[in-house]
């Protein structure tokens, strides 16, 4: 649980200012896995890469949220770094 | 619908170079075609912040590169040989998810040839 | 690299034929195929992306199926137009990949 929050935090501390926000809009687009909800606008387009990794495993705990983080940074054209991310949450 | 303008046709001599051109946006593309041959992925580049990725086999002979102002990508192929001969696109990602190519320019025809 | 392997790599039809054309990758690469098509001295055009996302203005008789490694480009009701070549490629990990391309030719 803490290396896959460790891991979504290091990428997301890894993106520049325009590229967090970027995230943040893909985010509340990017399709989900049934059952699981959407983290509102209103509070995700404020939120740091702290408080961001803080809500993405809250809302869809570690696994799910490093899995998402990384498809988001793929939608992003970050495959680097979404495979690190995912490589890290594997270890 | 967005175009994606690309000169026509280049003809070069061995052991030279060629920059190619491409008005675009986004995350630019370059795909390599050989007549009959299926689609090779050179590389990419982001036209907003300038980040590149290679495919290992064309790092040594392509550089990307970025004019913000005219929003125009450049592919310069160095060390040309007869196999180098192919069309060349360029192709932008703009759907926003799963990173497909989604807008192609009409490509550029390269011949190398003495 | 991932490599994205094609088959059949021709196939030879008439008109209103249901056609299916296969896509396997060397590794999980999730949802992240596109299916392309391109006809004679002509760039690439999206057909499919994300595995089952019809781009737009792509006629509903084409249809993306498949995740993990195991894809699919369904063509319900061939029509002349969409004689040409199909290439998948996958999104999921640099470098980009394709296949070598299935051709759809008139029996």
């Known amino acids: 649980m803490g290396r896959a929050r460790d891991a979504i935090l290091d990428a997301l501390e890894n993106l520049t200012a325009e590229e967090l926000k970027k995230f943040k809009l893909k985010l509340l687009s990017v399709p989900l896995r049934e059952g699981y909800g959407r983290i509102p606008r209103g509070a995700l387009l404020s939120m740091d890469a702290l408080d961001l990794t803080d809500k993405l495993v809250s809302f869809y705990a570690a696994t799910y949220g490093a899995e998402l983080t990384a498809n988001v940074l793929r939608d992003m054209g970050l495959q680097e770094m979404a495979g690190q991310l995912q490589a890290a949450t594997h270890q | 619908q967005v175009q994606l303008q690309q000169p026509g046709t280049e003809l070069v001599k061995p052991g030279a170079s060629v920059k190619l051109s491409c008005r675009a946006s986004g995350w630019t593309h370059w795909v390599k075609q050989r007549p009959g041959q299926g689609l090779e992925w050179i590389g990419n580049i982001n036209l907003s912040n300038g980040r590149t990725n290679y495919n290992?086999?064309f790092r040594a002979m392509a550089t990307l590169t970025v004019d913000k102002s005219s929003s125009t990508a450049y592919t310069q192929l160095s060390s040309l040989t007869s196999e180098d001969s192919a069309v060349y696109y360029c192709?932008?990602?703009?759907?926003?998810?799963?990173?497909?190519?989604?807008?192609w320019g009409q490509g550029t025809s390269v011949t190398v040839s003495s | 690299n991932i490599v994205m392997t094609q088959y059949p790599k021709s196939m030879s039809l008439s008109i209103g034929e249901r056609v299916t054309l296969r896509c396997k990758a060397s590794?999980?690469?999730?949802?992240?195929v596109s299916w392309y098509q391109q006809k004679p001295e002509q760039s690439p055009k999206l057909l499919i992306y994300?595995?089952?996302n019809r781009y737009t203005g792509v006629p509903d008789r084409f249809t993306g199926s498949g995740s993990a490694t195991d894809f699919i480009l369904t063509i319900t009701s061939v029509q002349a137009e969409d004689l040409a070549d199909y290439h998948c490629?996958?999104?999921?990990?640099?470098?980009?990949?394709f296949g070598a391309g299935t051709k759809l030719e008139l029996k």
């Open positions: 490629g996958q999104s999921y990990n640099y470098p980009l990949t």
């Open positions: 192709a932008n990602s703009m759907v926003p998810h799963f990173f497909p190519m989604d807008y």
């Open positions: 290992e086999k």
């Open positions: 994300g595995a089952s």
């Open positions: 590794e999980n690469v999730g949802s992240y």
